[in-house]
């Protein structure tokens, strides 16, 4: 860089680089203002005038500090069976979500392609394996002497009371049923929830110009084929 | 060339289960998933479940989901659909059909390919 | 769940004449990725289904041009601009925008 602080517009030293939120201009070759987020460039610079900038219209967005003539399309409406959990700002794009209780069964690079409902384990089975972001509730029968009186997406398998004197014995499905009046659970405490899954986001990524090619793009995906569960149902 | 083949026709009873098998060949089974479809005589096209077979990530039809089970085997590229506690009106001709999966980059097409059909029939 | 309905459910034609068939969604079919995953299926007599059309307008591979699919939101159609005697079968719609998948009642094509 020059000794003084240079203003853009400058012409870069031989071999040199733009400085932070500042572009290379291969019109001008001059080093000029990128535009903040929730801007564009309205007017590109040249070797006297600096980058013109303008707020992104409404349902338009930048992310980032850039040089683009026009800010990029917010993504369509949340699907019915998502909803938004960002709205459509200058400076973000809408964020859809797969709704509570169900998870993303399809993962593509634009986000949640498809959202499917968490299987329910039915009565006499418990959750072995909590529904996440991507992946569904995997059920166990309930081992003996535990139960579960649920249709439940959250629910374990939880231990029967202990009685004094059993009137009926529990099973899978039902608590065992005690004569006295002060009967204590085996180890575990009573209903056990667990938490729901973290929806996933589905986020449309925002190219962003430059002078080298851009970076290769990745996406997470859920690990493995899980074996299907028995004892589920739906609603 | 990318196909799916699926088992031969079946005959059940009342109550009885019945498992189809759906083989894919000609490309990456794992890349997609796969919907399966049946469809009564003379009757429209019901779908029943899907499954996707790179995650084992299933969603089925309401009225079926108590009573069946998509599963895959990826070793072999083979997709099953099990139905259980057969009724009389479950006979139809079951498909199965290749759709968009986790790792399908290119454009979606949809149900792209088709198995031939398994006919099950349901008699006392 | 998305409801898909057809009209007609049955359509006579005359070899080489257009017919068109019409397919509506009870709620919009475009995807928050913005796509619109509406496709057309075709059925010929003891055969599979074949897909023709996928997202409103695109032709699948090998299908004549002579088909042809517009619409959004909830509104489609289906053309076929010289019906050729293959043509006859059974014309569906589906949408694959959400859980549960579901396909309209189907229009049957055949020849006067």
């Known amino acids: 860089l020059p000794a003084q602080v240079a203003f853009t517009p400058y012409a870069p030293e031989p071999g040199g680089t733009c400085r932070l939120r500042e572009y290379y201009d291969q019109t001008a070759q001059m080093c000029c203002s990128k535009c903040p987020p929730g801007q564009h460039a309205k007017v590109f610079c040249t070797k006297t005038s600096d980058t013109v900038c303008d707020s992104c219209e409404d349902s338009t967005y930048t992310q980032l500090w850039n040089w683009v003539p026009e800010c990029l399309s917010c993504g369509s409406r949340c699907s019915s069976d998502q909803v938004e959990t960002q709205a459509c700002t200058r400076e973000q794009n809408r964020i859809c979500t797969c709704r509570p209780g169900w998870y993303c069964a399809l993962s593509k690079q634009e986000g949640c392609r498809l959202c499917a409902q968490l299987r329910k384990c039915r009565p006499g089975f418990g959750v072995a394996r909590p529904g996440t972001e991507t992946s569904d509730v995997v059920c166990k029968p309930c081992a003996p002497g535990t139960f579960s009186n649920t249709t439940s997406s959250t629910d374990i398998c939880r231990p029967h009371q202990i009685c004094h004197v059993v009137a009926i014995p529990g099973n899978a499905s039902m608590d065992a049923v005690c004569t006295s009046t002060s009967p204590t659970r085996s180890m575990a405490p009573g209903a056990v929830h667990l938490p729901q899954p973290v929806s996933t986001r589905s986020q449309h990524t925002q190219p962003t110009p430059a002078p080298s090619t851009a970076p290769g793009t990745s996406f997470l995906l859920p690990v493995g084929p899980s074996p299907p569960a028995e004892g589920s149902t739906g609603d | 060339q990318v196909q799916l083949v699926q088992s031969g026709a079946e005959v059940r009873k009342p109550g009885a289960s019945v498992k189809v098998s759906c083989k894919a060949s000609?490309?990456?089974?794992?890349?997609?998933?796969v919907t399966w479809v049946r469809q009564a005589p003379g009757q429209g096209l019901e779908w029943m479940g899907w499954i996707n077979a790179f995650s084992g990530n299933t969603h089925y039809a309401q009225n079926l989901q108590d009573r069946v089970t998509m599963t895959t085997d990826t070793s072999t590229s083979t997709a099953y659909m099990e139905l259980r506690s057969l009724r009389s009106d479950d006979t139809a001709v079951y498909y199965c059909?290749?759709?968009?999966?986790?790792?399908?980059?290119?454009?979606?097409?949809?149900?792209?390919?088709w198995g031939q059909g398994t006919t099950v029939t349901v008699s006392s | 769940d998305i409801v898909m309905t057809q009209t007609p459910l049955s359509s006579p034609v005359t070899l080489g004449q257009p017919a068109s068939i019409s397919c509506r969604s009870s709620?919009?079919?475009?995807?928050?990725?913005?796509?619109?995953?509406l496709s057309w299926l075709q059925q010929r007599p003891g055969q599979p289904p074949r897909l023709l059309i996928y997202?409103?307008?695109n032709r699948f591979s090998g299908v004549p041009d002579r088909f042809s699919g517009s619409g959004a939101g909830t509104d489609f159609t289906l053309k076929i601009s010289r019906v050729e005697a293959e043509d006859v079968g059974v014309y569906y719609c589906m949408q694959t925008t959400q859980f549960p998948f579901t396909f309209g009642p189907g229009t049957k094509v055949d020849i006067k």
């Open positions: 000609g490309y990456t089974f794992t890349s997609y998933s």
């Open positions: 997202k409103i307008s």
């Open positions: 709620q919009s079919l475009v995807h928050s990725d913005g796509n619109t995953y």
């Open positions: 059909a290749r759709e968009e999966g986790s790792g399908s980059y290119e454009d979606y097409y949809g149900m792209d390919v």
